[in-house]
Amino acid sequence: GIAIPRNSGCPNSEDKNFPRTVMVNLNIHNRNTSTNPKRSSDYYNRSTSPWNLHRNEDPERYPSVIWEAKCRHLGCVKADGNVDYHMNSVPIQQEILVLRREPRHCPNSFRLEKILVSVGCTCVTPIVHHVA
Amino acid sequence: GIAIPRNSGCPNSEDKNFPRTVMVNLNIHNRNTSTNPKRSSDYYNRSTSPWNLHRNEDPERYPSVIWEAKCRHLGCVKADGNVDYHMNSVPIQQEILVLRREPRHCPNSFRLEKILVSVGCTCVTPIVHHVA
C-alpha cells in the first residue's frame, strides 16, 4: 500500500486489514483528453507487423471484454505485400489492472488482478544466436 | 453495471446506489501465466519503430507509476540504421483502468478512471491523401 496521511474528510474504513480493502466508485471518469483523438484503429492492418484483435470475454471480470492482439505472421510485411522472414513480428504486451469478482458472482465485491494483454505488434530485428 | 444475481455468501452493500460503489481487495492476484514468458523487454530498441519509455508518476493514482512510450522517429528504421520517411512510426495506444483517490489523499476511497496510454510503437504504411 501507499502511506498517505488520512484526510479528516475521508470515508471511514471498517476493515481491520486497512487499506487492504478499499471502496471504489465504479462511475468511470474518462481522462482521454488525448491530442491524438484517433486511436490505433486501423494500425492493425497498415502495420508491417499486422495483427488481428480477438475478443476475450469474462463476466466475472471488470471490464468483462478485453481485446487481445495476435500477430498475423512471424515475419514482417514488405512494401510489396510479401512477408520478410529476416525480420520478426512480436507482440507488444502490457500488464493491466482489472477487477475480479470475489467471491465469484458477487456484484459488489472484487479483487484487483494484474493480467498481461497483447495490445498490438511491432517489427523487430531478430536476435542472432551465435553457436559456439 | 452488469446484472449478476447476488450470491447469498456475498458481502453486503450499504451503498444505496449499489453497485456504484464496491469493495475492492488490493491484494493483487497476478494471472500472468502466459505461454510467451518473454516480455516486450528489449523490443523498444530492436523495433523498426523504436520508442523511449517515460515515467509518469502520480501519488493520487493506483498504480502510481505508469510507463508511457514515445516513438523516437516519425519514420521507420531500415536495416542499415537510417530512417525511412516513406513509412510512419505510430504509437499503439490502449485504454486502461486505474484507481484515482477520491476524495484526494484518502487512502481507502477511490474512483475508477480510464486513461489512454501509449504502450509501444509500430511501423505503418502512410495514408496517402490524394488531392483532387
Partner: antibody, heavy 124, light 113 residues
C-alpha cells in the same frame, strides 16, 4: 461439438468459377480463423488461403490472382471462389478451423478441426 | 515455398512395435523470439479428413494418445509411435506453420504388415 461442412457443385466446367460454402457450428466465428485446403486425387495437401477472424485474408501466391475467401457471419458460413479453373483444380476441398490458443500472441496456421471434404471435378 | 520432405513414404508396421517418421524442412522452422518450432503432424485415416495430432513439434493435441510423440528442431523432425495400434493406420503428414504459404509433406502411408 465443433463441426464444419463443405457444400457446392461437384462438377465445374473448365474456365468457370468453382464456388464452395463451408457452414460451421460449435465455435465462435469472431475468435477463429478458417483455412481452405485441397487434396488432388491420390496426392498430398495444399493450403489455399485463410480468412482471419476480423475478415482479412491471406492467400497462397499460387492461387492469389484467382482465389477469393469470404465470410457471412450471420449465416455462420465461409465461402471459397476459385476462378478460371482447369482439370488441375480437380480435388477434394476442405475447410478447416485454425487453432486458437489463449495466452499465445500469434495467429496459428495449423488446423484443429476439419470438414469432411467435398470432391470437385473440373471437366467439360 | 518451403519444401517439406517426409521419409519413408510407406511404412509397414507390426502392432505393438514402435514406428518412426522423419520430416525435413528446406528452411529452419525455429522462431528465435520464443524458441518454438512451427511444425505440426496430422493423421488422415482411410476415407476421413486429416486430424491434428501434434503442433509446435511436440505438443499433443487434446485427446491424442500419449503413444504419439514429436521431437526435433530447426529443419529435422520426427514423429514416433511407441506401440502401434491397428487404428493408427493411415497417411501421416507434417506441416510447417512458419512461412506462408503453409506447406505439407507428401505424406507417409502407415499400414499393418
Amino acid at each position: 461439438q465443433v463441426q464444419l461442412q463443405e457444400s457446392g457443385p461437384g462438377l465445374v466446367k473448365p474456365s468457370e468459377t468453382l464456388s464452395l460454402t463451408c457452414t460451421v457450428s460449435g465455435f465462435s466465428l469472431p475468435s477463429h480463423s478458417v483455412s481452405w485446403i485441397r487434396q488432388p486425387p491420390g496426392k498430398g495437401l495444399e493450403w489455399i488461403g485463410i480468412i482471419w477472424n476480423q475478415g482479412g485474408t491471406d492467400y497462397n501466391s499460387a492461387f492469389k490472382s484467382r482465389v477469393t475467401i469470404s465470410v457471412d457471419t450471420s449465416k455462420n458460413q465461409f465461402s471459397l471462389k476459385l476462378s478460371s479453373v482447369t482439370a488441375a483444380d480437380t480435388a477434394v476441398y476442405y475447410c478447416a478451423r485454425n487453432a486458437y490458443i489463449t495466452d499465445y500472441y500469434y495467429e496459428n496456421y495449423f488446423m484443429d478441426a476439419w470438414g469432411q471434404g467435398t470432391l470437385v471435378t473440373v471437366s467439360s | 515455398d518451403i519444401v517439406m520432405t517426409q521419409s519413408p513414404l510407406s511404412l509397414p508396421v507390426t502392432p505393438g512395435e514402435p514406428a518412426s517418421i522423419s520430416c525435413k524442412s528446406s528452411q529452419s522452422l525455429l522462431f528465435s523470439e520464443n524458441q518454438k518450432n512451427y511444425l505440426a503432424w496430422y493423421l488422415q485415416k482411410p476415407g476421413q479428413s486429416p486430424q491434428l495430432l501434434i503442433y509446435w513439434t511436440s505438443t499433443r493435441q487434446s485427446g491424442v494418445p500419449d503413444r504419439f510423440s514429436g521431437s526435433g528442431s530447426g529443419t529435422d523432425f520426427t514423429l514416433k509411435i511407441s506401440r502401434v495400434e491397428a487404428e493408427d493406420v493411415g497417411v501421416y503428414y507434417c506441416q510447417q506453420s512458419y512461412y506462408t504459404p503453409y506447406t505439407f509433406g507428401q505424406g507417409t502411408k502407415v499400414e499393418i504388415k
